[in-house]
């Protein structure tokens, strides 16, 4: 009987699905911001127009998704990149190939309890294209145990190569499982 | 007391996980069927053989997954494409590269409340292959707020380049979070 | 009142989200193990260091994630591959291209009730790179109905091409929906 009666009062521990923190953010035009060489640039996001939303205390602020409740979250992002012929595709250099250009996406966690940002997910791809204009997505998604107050951001190797034209091509989201 | 008694009728608001609408559809051989010019072709799917299933009022009909209950859904698809050497890979043309071939997947939402189909997710990739036979997947997945009656489909740029041979290579699914 | 009392007894059927089996495994250095030619090699994983964890009776043993409870699971993996120039990218051979090298990931289910392993998910990509060092991920994720005791593993076409340097580049996970 005790168990039966105490279950409902424990309900807050088991947040119903409809009340779970969740967000789907979509790309917006980036303002070029100087950042340190060899440091990945953080993207900023649309959080309430079109397909974008934040719900149930999941908050977006200053490039970060802020986790409102400890638990296991599924986090995902797709970044579509686009560019012109990469240097390593120069046919005159094929016999002496150089280090290829590359595109990289990192989903990073910043925690107050830990000074160093943690790389949760990385997608990285060499790009060696001989066509005039190339384009391709990198998709990432996985589950992580997060703490209340943890902040998530998406970093890319070259902000100028990100396709920010459409919300369905470049996006970032998370939900409590 | 009123609230307690009305809860069961409101049960759809907090659907238990096991009762949540969900589907995993797998590829089946397409019959070449003409569709409007410049319009992406919609794929049709297996919904109850092998790994494929629909559950809890999630319904598959005529290329569409039909959403039975409003809520936030995780939607995903992988399409494996394959083909032969693409023209832009022709080594004699490298100095004057042409527009590359490309492969595109779009997960589209059709809503009775809105006349225009909405692109939820797009994966698009230039293809410039100098090898004999090329093959590669495009994966998409994200969360969207959907309404009862919304219909989801998967469209591709070229139906003749899709790998239809195996259910584990080309698939489409959704579940209420 | 009736509802409050009956809910807990139904609780086992609808496992609360916090009690659901789940795991996120990360790559570790592989010991080269001989396996049959043309047979995919199974990866082994880190299950409790860094970002890796198993929870709520989800168990990792001997390259397998063991499913503790029947239900619908979302299963995902990313494998980052890396290598040097693939043979078909040899510029002198462009006019007579050979079969391209390829990279393949398969998430496989082994069930006691069925002797043959089942391929749940396959990601396969031709690799024909003219750059000196190439690298790229294959991502997979989908939902499957699994039975208690089912075992999941990740197989790859060439274990020597897997990037095992970072837990955020190569990983494998599953959670009960």
């Amino acid at each position: 009987v005790t168990e039966e009666r105490s279950a409902p009062s424990a309900q807050p521990v088991y947040t119903p699905s409809r009340d779970k923190p969740k967000a789907h953010l979509t790309i917006m035009r980036q303002t070029p911001v100087p950042h340190l060489k060899n440091e990945l640039a953080a993207l900023h996001w649309e959080n309430n127009l079109g397909m974008a939303f934040t719900k149930n205390r999941m908050n977006y602020t200053n490039k970060f998704l802020v986790i409102p409740e400890s638990g296991d979250y599924f986090i995902y992002s797709q970044i579509t990149f686009r560019g012109t012929t990469s240097e390593c595709g120069d046919i005159s250099r094929v016999r002496r190939p150089k280090k290829p250009d590359s595109i990289t996406v990192v989903i990073t966690k910043v925690a107050d309890s830990y000074p160093e940002p943690a790389h949760l997910l990385t997608g990285t791809k060499s790009v060696c294209e001989i066509s005039s204009n190339w384009f391709q997505p990198i998709y990432l998604g996985a589950m992580f145990s997060l703490e209340e107050g943890d902040r998530l951001m998406v970093n890319v190797s070259d902000i100028s190569l990100v396709d920010y034209t459409k919300e369905d091509k470049t996006f970032f989201g998370a939900f409590l499982i | 007391v009123t609230e307690e008694r009305s809860a069961p009728s409101a049960q759809p608001v907090y659907t238990p996980s096991r009762d949540k609408p969900k589907a995993h559809l797998t590829i089946m051989r397409q019959t070449p069927v003409p569709h409007l010019k410049n319009e992406l072709a919609a794929l049709h799917w297996e919904n109850n053989l092998g790994m494929a299933f629909t559950k809890n009022r999630m319904n598959y009909t005529n290329k569409f997954l039909v959403i039975p209950e409003s809520g936030d859904y995780f939607i995903y698809s992988q399409i494996t494409f394959r083909g032969t050497t693409s023209e832009c890979g022709d080594i004699s043309r490298v100095r004057r590269p042409k527009k590359p071939d490309s492969i595109t997947v779009v997960i589209t939402k059709v809503a009775d409340s809105y006349p225009e189909p909405a692109h939820l997710l797009t994966g698009t990739k230039s293809v410039c292959e100098i090898s004999s036979n090329w093959f590669q997947p495009i994966y998409l997945g994200a969360m969207f707020s959907l309404e009862e009656g919304d219909r989801l489909m998967v469209n591709v740029s070229d139906i003749s380049l899709v790998d239809y041979t195996k259910e584990d290579k080309t698939f489409f699914g959704a579940f209420l979070i | 009142v009736t509802e409050e009392r009956s809910a807990p007894s139904a609780q086992p059927v609808y496992t609360p989200s916090r009690d659901k089996p789940k795991a996120h495994l990360t790559i570790m250095r592989q010991t080269p193990v001989p396996h049959l030619k043309n047979e995919l090699a199974a990866l082994h994983w880190e299950n409790n260091l860094g970002m890796a964890f198993t929870k709520n009776r989800m168990n990792y043993t001997n390259k397998f994630l063991v499913i503790p409870e029947s239900g619908d699971y979302f299963i995902y993996s990313q494998i980052t591959f890396r290598g040097t120039t693939s043979e078909c990218g040899d510029i002198s051979r462009v006019r007579r291209p050979k079969k391209p090298d390829s990279i393949t990931v398969v998430i496989t289910k082994v069930a006691d009730s069925y002797p043959e392993p089942a391929h749940l998910l396959t990601g396969t990509k031709s690799v024909c790179e003219i750059s000196s060092n190439w690298f790229q991920p294959i991502y997979l994720g989908a939902m499957f109905s699994l039975e208690e005791g089912d075992r999941l593993m990740v197989n790859v076409s060439d274990i020597s091409l897997v990037d095992y340097t970072k837990e955020d580049k190569t990983f494998f996970g599953a959670f009960l929906i």
């Epitope: - | 089946m28 051989r29 070449p32 394959r82 070229d158 003749s160 041979t165 195996k166 | -």
Partner: antibody, heavy 117, light 108 residues
């Protein structure tokens, strides 16, 4: 190198059943659809039907009622049966690999089937 | 079903010359899903072109395809001795798949 080797009876009487088999070597069997096509002497080609490694079939509607295509994945073989043949079914029958889709990049050597009383 | 008509029936040319073969469909071929094959006497057909203009693996670049809608063309820029054969077109934009009657390219 992919090779398709086919065999079966070449001479049939009207109303009999045509039976041909095609064995695939030198490549993956499960990654493709496999097709039968025929060519009457001096004429064009006609698509008969196709099968996947898992046994999924599609047939030309004009022949569907008389045709069965089957597969033996363990042997990397697929077969064609056509019932109630007539002289109009006399042709060279080819097996072929479908790649990328609905076009045929590797072919068997062909089997001449003659239907005559 | 879509009927494909090839013309001319026979084309008499010399090695080194260019050849233009026509394939006309009874209705529009969806997405230019048209292929070309070469067949030599006693041999199986060989895939040359698919998607109206995509060359199949190992096909030399003197073979090119073009066209859309109902009218398609196979062009051989410089005929070599091994190119004298029968050429068939095939549409796969509508079910069932259908083939043309063929054009014979012979040595003049």
């Amino acid at each position: 190198q992919v090779q398709l080797q086919q065999w079966g009876a070449g001479l049939l009487k009207p109303s009999e059943t045509l039976s041909l088999t095609c064995a695939v070597s030198g490549g993956s069997f499960s990654d493709y659809f496999w097709t039968w096509i025929r060519q009457p002497p001096g004429k064009g080609l006609e698509w008969i039907g196709e099968i996947s490694h898992s046994g999924r079939t599609n047939y030309n509607p004009s022949l569907k009622s008389r045709v069965t295509i089957s597969v033996d994945t363990s042997m990397s073989q697929f077969s064609l049966k056509m019932t109630s043949v007539t002289a109009a079914d006399s042709a060279v029958y080819y097996c072929a690999r479908d790649y990328p889709n609905w076009v045929f990049d590797y072919w068997g050597q062909g089997t001449l089937v003659t239907v005559s009383s | 079903e879509i009927e494909l008509t090839q013309s001319p029936g026979t084309l008499s040319l010399s090695p080194g010359e260019g050849a233009t073969l026509s394939c006309r469909a009874s209705q529009s071929v969806f997405n230019s899903y048209l292929a070309w094959y070469q067949q030599k006497p006693g041999q199986a057909p060989r895939l040359l072109i698919y998607g109206a203009s995509r060359r199949a693996t190992g096909i030399p670049d003197r073979f090119s395809g073009s066209g859309s809608g109902t009218d398609f063309t196979l062009t051989i820029s410089r005929l070599e001795p091994g190119d004298f054969a029968v050429y068939f077109c095939q549409q796969y934009g509508n079910s069932p798949l259908t083939f043309g009657g063929g054009t014979k390219v012979e040595i003049k």
